[in-house]
């Protein structure tokens, strides 16, 4: 078991055409974060590097915005954006921490935000 924990926005839902913020927070460790990767399934969406700043993958540049903080904003959502998203914290000396968020993009206006939960 690692020393830190990642808190995420958990299971969330949003309306088609709208936007959503994906957020993770690493706590309970003194390790230094050198980079956070945001991934959807096996696709890299974005990187926030402590030295180099943000890099958004070219194929997502039009619909992904950096922040707030180490989070990621997804815009112009489509039903195809439904699925798992991962924040991957690269730290030293702890190694890698991974948080999971499940996003459901809904056709109607019944989208609700889920509760926050922790992944050790």
């Amino acid at each position: 078991m690692m020393t830190g924990t990642i808190e995420t926005t958990g299971n969330i839902s949003a309306e088609k055409g709208g936007s959503i913020i994906l957020q993770c927070h690493l706590s309970s460790t003194t390790a230094q974060v050198t980079q956070v990767n945001w991934e959807q399934q096996d696709q890299l969406l974005a990187i926030c590097n402590a030295d180099l700043g943000w890099h958004i993958s070219p194929s997502f540049k039009d619909r992904v915005a950096p922040g707030p903080g180490l989070g990621l904003t997804l815009q112009s959502l489509t039903v195809n954006d439904t699925g798992e998203y991962f924040c991957i914290y690269h730290t030293y000396p702890d190694g890698t921490y991974t948080g999971r968020i499940f996003l459901e993009v809904l056709e109607s206006s019944v989208a609700e935000h889920g509760a926050r939960f922790q992944i050790p």
Epitope: M1, T3, T34, N49, D51, I88, H90, D94
Partner: antibody
Amino acid sequence: QLQLQESGPGLVKPAETLSLTCTVSGGSISSYDHYWTWIRQPPGKCLEWIGTVYYSGSTFHNPSLKSRVTIPVDTSKNQFSLKLSSVTAADTAVYYCARVGPDVSHPPFDYWGQGTLVTVSS
Amino acid sequence: DIQMTQSPSSLSASVGDRVTITCRASQSISSYLNWYQQKPGKAPKLLIYAASSLQSGVPSRFSGSGSGTDFTLTISSLQPEDFATYYCQQSYSTPITFGCGTKVEIK
């Protein structure tokens, strides 16, 4: 198979700067999942962690070496370096470069260079 | 800094013997303890990581145990190629620190 190779002068004069380079082959230094490290071992003595660097330049170093250490990275050459300033005879040691991995919690040093002896003497 | 203390500093053993080396940390390091083998003129080689996980390619006669502050490296049946110096290392926090080694010699 990943390989690390240290290179640099074997003799350095007191008060000068020790400069070593570690060339990584068989893998990319820009891997997001690994950090890169310098460790030294004075003759007949214990291993000492000098410092660790990430591909982007984030550096962690041993406070015992104060501000004498810098660890530059050159991703275009797949290399990282060690610069240790104001050396004394106490810095005479075999210097190793190593990779921090594998992808586990609080990872160990899983690949090492063969080491290079640096003697500080006038 | 976390101090790592190994014992004994040296030991003599015969081929086929069961050998046990201990490592103690000055504070709890959970299971973030690694073991290395070093032969003269060579770089250290990773044997065990995370206290008890065997590194790929390392013979199963090597095993590790412990958590918190007390750890053990065991060689179940010493082989001729096992005569070397063994080091423990904590990867719990920086500065990373090593024990000063246990030299295993031929009796």
